[in-house]
């Protein structure tokens, strides 16, 4: 039960994360015009990975695509590549994880195969999340560098009468969406990898051995408390005297307020 929950939750978290990565990649607000300590302009500039936009006070917004590939900064190309790789890996991971879900039965698929698929998708989600985080972080670093360079330029070369206002850019909403989405995908991937451990069949064959506990003359046989599924359940089904501790599968879970996000 806990394994299924962990796997299911990992899938959902990754799904939200990948949707966020796609949204961030498509968003136009990767960098937005810095309005702090700037003359108040009636024009607001913002830029994405694919186009730059200008919104006028009139409400008119004009966006122009970057219709060049070679003329773009290498860093921007790298960010694009990282985000696309993240999306592709995430999409493949989602596809694989659907078939790996314990709650979905596809033919006579071995549980070991499901475990392998869960691990594969988990790794894919982890790499996808890392790609997104890396892409967003590279872009953020680029912004910080350019911000301070343009700030320096604002206070130099003003010997003449005419001043040119340098448009400075700061972090846009897409960066925060990307960071959160990348983090969620990463967490989802880790959860899938954890779930994989619970799905993997144990190699140990438990023999019917009599355990003689002091003061008790009871023979314990594995699988005596639950009907064995024949897949890694022996470890869970062993009842031990542990002062009333119960295995995860047996604990009654109650919904908490944090379950509803």
């Amino acid at each position: 039960m806990a394994v299924t929950a962990c796997q299911g939750l990992g899938f959902v978290v990754s799904l939200i994360g990948i949707a966020g990565i796609i949204a961030a990649t498509c968003m136009d607000q990767w960098s937005t015009q810095d309005l702090y300590n700037n003359p108040v302009t009636a024009v607001f500039n913002y830029q994405g990975l694919w186009r730059s936009c200008v919104r006028e006070s009139s409400g008119f917004t004009e966006c122009r695509g970057y219709f060049t590939l070679l003329g773009l900064p290498a860093m921007l190309q790298a960010v694009r590549a990282l985000m696309i790789v993240g999306i592709v890996l995430g999409a493949i991971g989602l596809l694989v994880s659907i078939f790996a879900l314990k709650c979905i039965r596809i033919g006579s698929m071995e549980d070991s195969a499901k475990a392998n698929m869960t691990l594969t998708s988990g790794i894919m989600f982890i790499v996808s999340g890392l790609c997104a985080i890396a892409g967003v972080s590279v872009f953020a670093n680029m912004l910080v560098t350019n911000f301070w360079m343009s700030t320096a330029n604002m206070y130099t070369g003003m010997g003449g009468m005419v001043q040119t206002v340098q448009t400075r850019y700061t972090f846009g909403a897409a960066l925060f969406v990307g960071w959160v989405a990348g983090g969620l995908t990463l967490i989802g991937g880790v959860m899938m990898c954890i779930a994989c451990r619970g799905l993997a069949p144990e190699e140990t064959n438990y023999k019917a051995v009599s355990y003689h506990a002091s003061g008790h003359s009871v023979a314990y046989k594995p699988g005596g408390f639950k009907a064995s599924t024949g897949f890694g359940s022996n470890t869970k089904n062993k009842k031990i005297y542990d002062g009333g501790a119960r295995t995860e599968d047996e604990v009654q879970s109650y919904p908490s307020k944090h379950d509803y996000v």
Partner: antibody
Framework: QIQLVQSGPELKKPGETVKISCKAS????????MNWVKQAPGKGLKWMGW????????TYADDFKGRFAFSSETSARTAYLQINNLKNEDMATYFC???????????WGQGTLVTVSS | DIVMTQSPSFLTVTAGEKVTMSCKSS????????????LTWYQQKPGQPPKLLIY???TRDSGVPDRFTGSGSGTDFTLTITSVQAEDLAVFYC?????????FGSGTKLEIK
């Protein structure tokens, strides 16, 4: 077609209040901001500020902060300019104008002459 | 505030002549985001409200005759009327449409001989 029709001329005494209206037609009122421009007799144009007719937020030029207030009534498709505590230097023609491409003042009202005389 | 300086203040020309008027701003009106200059030209005929002629420094508004041409970039702008007509008698204003507060030039009064 887009039209801005302003209220008629006003004759006021110093210290009084005047409220000029600007009724819009031919477009979605909340889609375009409304600007106000002052033109003293025989003088040039002076931008007073504008009101975002969607949010109701106003931006005023420094010379028009305090006694001047912009407002709008979406249901009536009308923008208003109110001048409190009128002074002699407020005697002018006041124009309303909508923002267009390039933040230009694309469509203008016919103007409202405010005369301040004791 | 941005200062808009127009020259000359008065222009007297004969019909059919080419006329050029200048407008200078104290700061660049070029927006790097779209490479457009936020400079607007208006024509105000006697007893009428101003009429939009040109926005983005060089884009003619719909219905404006093609004898009106706007040019320039950054801080220096020009309005050219290739063949002045009798109905062009008016005051022409340039306006900063980039920085708040929007500011107008003092105007160039065009008179026909």
């Amino acid at each position: 077609q887009i039209q801005l029709v302003q209220s008629g001329p006003e004759l006021k005494k110093p210290g009084e209040t005047v409220k000029i209206s600007c009724k819009a037609s031919g477009y979605t009122f909340t889609n375009y901001g409304m600007n106000w421009v002052k033109q003293a007799p025989g003088k040039g144009l002076k931008w007073m500020g504008w009101i975002n007719t969607y949010t109701g937020e106003s931006t005023y030029a420094d010379d028009f902060k305090g006694r001047f207030a912009f407002s709008s009534e979406t249901s009536a498709r009308t923008a208003y300019l109110q001048i409190n505590n009128l002074k002699n230097e407020d005697m002018a023609t006041y124009f309303c104008a909508t923002l267009g491409y390039g933040n230009s003042l694309a469509y203008w009202g016919q103007g409202t002459l405010v005369t301040v005389s004791s | 505030d941005i200062v808009m300086t127009q020259s000359p203040s008065f222009l007297t020309v004969t019909a059919g002549e080419k006329v050029t008027m200048s407008c200078k701003s104290s700061q660049s009106l070029l927006n790097s985001g779209n490479q457009k200059n936020y400079l607007t030209w208006y024509q105000q005929k006697p007893g009428q409200p101003p009429k939009l002629l040109i926005y983005w420094a060089s884009t003619r508004d719909s219905g404006v005759p093609d004898r009106f041409t706007g040019s320039g970039s950054g801080t220096d702008f020009t309005l050219t009327i290739t063949s002045v007509q009798a109905e062009d008698l008016a005051v022409f204003y340039c306006q900063n449409a980039y920085f708040y507060p929007f500011t107008f030039g003092s105007g160039t009064k065009l008179e026909i001989k």
